[in-house]
Interface confidence: medium
């Protein structure tokens, strides 16, 4: 798409022009004060020393005061991520300040020069907030900066130069490349403000990593394990866009961290919550559902100050779409035998029933693999709020789905070709819902009956003892 | 490079309705904001309200905030500018123009569109 | 709604002179913006934020004010710039335009 003009004109614009039509000299990062939720309004321009905008454009000096910078931009002008944030903000925080950091011109740049850029644009927003701080009722502990890409560095620079100590820094998605394995002072840091969240939706272990994967705030998380978000995958874009490209799907990804954040600010009646893990392989074996020791948090901007003594990486699964929230379920199936197993991996379903809903049919994901005599735990999530759980039923896929199975299967029959039934014995489920943080126990509805093979199915309801509580915090209530 | 291609002139009687088309080419079509603005014969611009085509938000003028439905079809880059309950003064060329958020200028015109209200 | 007048209707100059343009707002806007229009066509940006120039606008044309008083300046007038000004506020909706002056050749 072509470049329009910037509020600054293009940097071409300016290289080239003469002289005599430029009536002042623009700097490169400017401060837009957003005086309203509608992108049509332009707002106020505020600039050091300048005390007139501050009071003709109401800067209220004793509320929250919001910065947003952008990153690194292909097109030149600001995208629509930027308005929806500014509105979401101005609808939850109706007396705040909210002021878009334009440094447009030193962003529409390659890539490795609007980075050299950061510390310089870092620096203009210490010395806007040092100004600020010169005022009466200003307070540094009101300042949020919420930093998209490579504005998140920004924002830890700004945070870094500040004189004093700024409230709070979010990081949406921090950029990766050329940041990965940096020195703390030369990318965002949890020493850059009071407290440091971080969300990380665009990681990846093989190739080009757009956003950052190494934590770098008090709390990090890393919604779908941080790389492939739903609704994001070709299909999704091609599907939505009639020019849905690859390059689609990476905005898709790495945008997604501003919709959670837009998401939190306006559902805030349905949070999201994230859960504490060493990683996101134990998080998707459903291991790390536990609030205890504020091992949970909400994410965006609700989430609750924590100033860990390291980096807490936090994960969660999330919907495709607004609102993001999703009903986290713990299940710990304990095997006590099993035969005729094979080389290969049961494929398992199970079937959530409530008071409110009953959930799809969702699959087991087997990390690793299944253990006999052993507790098998895995996550599974819901879209909707079931309520109460009442019963449960699991399914045992019959004809394999994927030719891997297959092969595996045929491979098998030949080694042992008169390879009697496979067979599993499960006598009880154990569900805690990451939400509630409640514990139950689910037994076979017929006790004697505690076997599943292939193309079966078994259902267990509530045992009678109901449901067990354990002293665990809910995430619904504050943490400390 | 960046146009705004407008639908033809329209004859409409009193009290019927007229559905003016901008069909947006050359950028990415739901990064701006769409405004149409009127202009009667001989006299000043007015503006009437605008559309984000990349989720659908709308803003009115007060003065047609019930005659006017502004919508778009992101499929083929097009926004629309729906009068109802056309009356004689409603006798303008309605343009259609390209803003971008937060830069704050109409940078790219429709061409325009006549609209004749005559029983 | 925020009114703008402009002032005068009709400038009736020769060209090579320097045209002086009015616009006023009923309260105080932060920025003002200036178009060019000439029969049978649309609108044309020449101003944006007061007092820059959009691309490919020559240099005779500048703007200032702020406040309530904002003024468009033709340095020189040139054949092609025989046309009507309008100008323009985005401080608050609904968004205003002047009633325009017609710059004619005397």
């Known amino acids: 798409s072509p470049v329009p003009f910037g509020p600054e004109g293009r940097l071409e614009d300016k290289l080239h022009k003469p002289k005599a039509t430029q009536t002042e000299v623009k700097p490169s990062v400017r401060f837009n004060l957003r005086t309203s939720k509608d992108p049509e309004h332009e707002g106020c321009y505020l600039s050091v020393g300048h005390s007139q905008p501050l009071e003709d454009c109401s800067f209220n000096m004793t509320a929250k005061t919001f910065f947003i910078i952008h990153g690194w931009t292909m097109s030149g002008i600001f995208e629509n991520w930027l308005h929806k944030l500014v509105s979401a903000l101005h609808t939850r925080e109706k007396d705040a300040n909210v002021v878009v950091v334009d440094w447009l011109p030193l962003a529409h740049q390659l890539y490795t020069d609007a980075v050299n850029n950061t510390r310089v644009v870092g620096h203009s927003i210490a010395r806007m907030l040092d100004w600020l701080q010169e005022k009466d009722d200003f307070s540094l502990g009101n300042v949020h900066l919420i930093g998209y890409s490579l504005g998140a560095h920004v924002a830890g620079y700004a945070g870094n130069f500040v004189k004093g100590t700024v409230g709070r820094i979010t990081g949406l998605d921090p950029a990766g490349p050329m940041f990965e394995g940096a020195d703390i002072h030369k990318r965002l840091s949890p020493d850059d403000a009071d407290f440091v969240d971080v969300l990380h939706t665009y990681t990846r272990s093989f190739g080009l990593s757009i956003g950052i994967q190494m934590p770098v705030g008090h709390i990090d998380i890393y919604p779908n394990g941080g790389d492939f978000q739903p609704g994001c995958g070709l299909n999704d874009v091609l599907g939505s866009i009639a020019y849905g490209t690859i390059t689609e799907v990476v905005k898709c990804e790495h945008e997604r961290a501003v919709h959670l954040f837009v998401d939190s600010l306006v559902n805030q009646d349905k949070p999201s919550f994230a859960f504490q893990c060493t990683d996101s392989n134990r998080f998707k074996k459903g291991i790390c559902l536990s609030c205890r020791k504020n091992r949970c948090n909400s994410i965006g901007y609700n989430a609750k100050k924590m100033r860990n003594k390291r980096n807490s990486k936090m994960y969660l699964k999330t919907r495709a779409g607004m609102p993001f929230r999703v009903y986290h379920y713990q299940m710990k199936i304990h095997v006590f035998s099993y035969k005729n197993m094979g080389e290969i991996e049961p494929t398992f379903y199970v079937t959530l029933y409530g008071t409110n809903a009953d959930s799809q049919t969702l699959p087991l994901e087997i990390v690793e693999r299944i253990e006999q005599n052993a507790t098998n735990t895995f996550l599974v999530y819901t879209e909707e709020d079931l309520g109460d759980l009442l019963k449960i039923q699991l399914t045992w896929e019959g004809a394999s789905q994927s030719w891997y199975n297959l092969w595996k299967e045929f491979r098998s029959y030949l080694s042992q070709p008169r390879n009697p039934g496979r067979e599993l014995n499960i006598r009880r489920i154990r569900v805690k819902s990451g939400e509630t943080q409640r514990k139950l126990t689910f037994c076979t509805e017929d006790p004697e009956n505690t076997s599943i093979s292939p193309g079966r199915e078994l259902w267990f309801r509530k045992c009678r003892d109901g449901w067990r509580m354990k002293n665990e915090t809910s995430p619904t209530v504050e943490l400390p | 490079q960046v146009q705004l291609v407008q639908s033809g002139a329209e004859v409409k009687k009193p009290g019927a309705s007229v559905k003016v088309s901008c069909k947006a080419s050359g950028y990415t079509f739901t990064e701006y904001t769409m405004h149409w603005v009127r202009q009667a014969p001989g006299q000043g611009l007015e503006w009437m309200g605008s559309i984000n085509p990349y989720y659908g938000g709308t803003s009115y003028n007060e003065k047609f905030k019930d005659r006017v439905t502004s919508t778009r079809d992101t499929s083929i880059s097009t926004a629309y500018m729906e009068l109802s309950r056309l009356r004689s003064d409603d006798t303008v060329v309605y343009y259609c123009?390209?803003?971008?958020?937060?830069?704050?200028?109409?940078?790219?015109w429709g061409q325009g569109t006549t609209v004749t209200v005559s029983s | 709604e925020i009114v703008l007048t402009q002032s005068p209707g009709t400038l009736s100059l020769s060209p090579g002179e320097r045209a002086t343009l009015s616009c006023r707002a009923s309260s105080s806007v932060h920025y003002m913006y200036w178009y060019q229009q000439k029969p049978g066509q649309a609108p044309r940006l020449l101003i944006y934020y007061t007092s820059n120039l959009a691309p490919g606008i020559p240099d005779r044309f500048s703007g200032s004010g702020s406040g309530t008083d904002f003024t468009l300046t033709i340095s020189r007038l040139e054949p092609e710039d025989f046309a009507v000004y309008y100008c323009q506020q985005f401080t608050s909706s609904p968004y205003t335009f002047g009633g325009g002056t017609k710059v004619e050749i005397k």
């Open positions: 123009a390209r803003y971008g958020n937060y830069v704050g200028y109409f940078d790219y």
